[in-house]
Interface confidence: medium
């Protein structure tokens, strides 16, 4: 039996949320039972259709109504013929969308004016992904390539930070991290240290 994926190039790129129909053509079999495989695992999916082109030529469709990142991967179709499994050439499905965060800024508790770092990382596709940092509603740095580390020289009050990831498909906003002031006991060195520093918020360094 001749088996091939139809209507799809070797690489297929689709935007998140869009429908996809993968077509598989089977020739030389009267009753093919087409199975779809993704990354080596059979797709247990009833969203399939079969169209007989002729008695010995069939087209099977795998319908994905609204693709998401988890649908990305290597697909192929297979049929059993005389006890042997025949597989088609694969198609690589890439799902593009707004950036997806793999690292988001975390809540912290820091002494007044003590330096700290916040991390942010987001991925595509599509790449590249750039990061912009926000302190409350004020943009404080960027854009810079993902991943990004924000170095803050210190804060004197509870402050909120977030990052924003941009790519060609749009932008995504991270969770908001709250940096709380750690209460320092009177008489401690940290407390005196506080008095020797200016209390104004310092502009952070913005670096990769």
């Amino acid at each position: 039996a001749g088996l091939k994926l139809m209507g799809a190039p070797v690489k297929l790129t689709v935007s998140q949320g869009q429908p996809v129909k993968l077509n598989c053509s089977v020739e030389g079999m009267e009753e093919p039972d087409i199975q779809w495989v993704k990354d080596g695992a059979v797709v247990q999916n009833l969203d399939q259709l079969y169209i007989p082109v002729s008695e010995q030529h069939w087209i099977g469709f795998l319908s994905l109504k609204s693709v998401e990142r988890s649908d990305a991967g290597r697909y192929w179709c297979q049929v059993e013929d005389g006890g042997e499994t025949e597989i088609s050439q694969p198609v690589w499905l890439t799902v593009e969308g707004v950036p997806f965060f793999t690292v988001e800024p975390k809540d912290l508790a820091v002494p007044p004016n003590a330096p700290f770092q916040l991390s942010c990382e987001a991925v595509g596709p599509p790449e590249p992904v750039t990061i912009v940092w926000w302190r409350g509603t004020t943009k404080i740095g960027g854009p810079a390539p993902s991943p990004s580390v924000l170095n803050v020289t210190g804060v004197t009050q509870s402050t909120m930070f977030s990052c924003e990831a941009h790519n060609l498909k749009g932008l995504a906003s991270s969770r908001t991290a709250t940096v709380h002031l750690q209460l320092v006991p009177r008489g401690s060195s940290a407390h005196h240290h506080h008095h020797h520093h200016h209390s104004a918020w310092s502009h952070p360094q913005f670096e990769k």
Partner: antibody, heavy 116, light 108 residues
């Protein structure tokens, strides 16, 4: 004309076994899956399961897995729904249907009554 | 197990628009199908793949889907549209199908 002819109504006692049939005509049997749908008296439709066109694989709804068996004989273009041990709650109308999502052609249904 | 939720009943006057909803967690990823069952009859496919009208179905029947909700709309309902309507779709993995509980449409 596409037709699905189902076996006649049956009355059984709890614990009995039963097989009902659905014979297809007017199309090539192996061109389509066959599904079975249950409808209890005065209630809604329930998808029981489907068998692939080549009769090599079956899919069952969670409520029916292990309680019924779907099979088919391609030589006679007939699909079957089988129980090993009937329960009173199996009393219902059972439809065989051509397809599995696009359920376009329905049989007339087989009424199964399970009563002691 | 996966469930599709429909209102038990919807009532409209003839000529009014009837909307029957179907809610399910997998509907953002899975197509909805709608079946009409008139009293004592086998069901009939009305809408497939969310919004495509089955052959022989009047134009007043339409379907849509957004997020976890699918909707069957009958614009200008007729007395002959009085029936039970069932939505039908696959679970998240796509390895089994489910009917909604059904909605009894009354056209008064």
């Amino acid at each position: 004309e596409v037709q699905l002819v189902q076996s006649g109504a049956d009355v059984k006692k709890p614990g009995a076994s039963l097989t009902i049939s659905c014979q297809a005509s007017g199309y090539t049997f192996t061109d389509y899956w066959i599904s079975w749908v249950r409808q209890k008296p005065g209630k809604g439709l329930e998808w029981m399961g489907s068998i692939t066109r080549s009769s090599s694989r079956t899919h069952y709804g969670p409520s029916f897995q292990g309680h019924v068996t779907i099979s088919a004989d391609r030589s006679t273009a007939t699909a079957y729904l089988q129980w090993r041990s009937l329960e009173a709650s199996d009393t219902a109308m059972y439809y065989c249907v051509r397809g599995y999502t696009h359920l376009r052609t329905w049989g007339p249904g087989t009424l199964v009554t399970v009563s002691s | 197990s996966y469930e599709l939720t429909q209102p038990p009943s919807v009532s409209v006057s003839p000529g009014q628009t009837a909307r029957i909803t179907c809610s399910g967690d997998a509907l953002p990823k899975k197509y909805a199908y709608w079946y009409q069952q008139k009293s004592g009859q086998a069901p009939v496919l009305v809408i497939y793949e969310d919004s495509k009208r089955s052959s022989g179905i009047p134009e007043r029947f339409s379907g849509s889907s957004s997020g976890t909700m699918a909707t069957l709309t009958i614009s200008g309902a007729q007395v002959e549209d009085e029936a039970d309507y069932y939505c039908y779709s696959a679970n998240q993995r796509g390895n089994y199908m489910v009917f909604g509980g059904g909605t009894k449409l009354t056209v008064l």
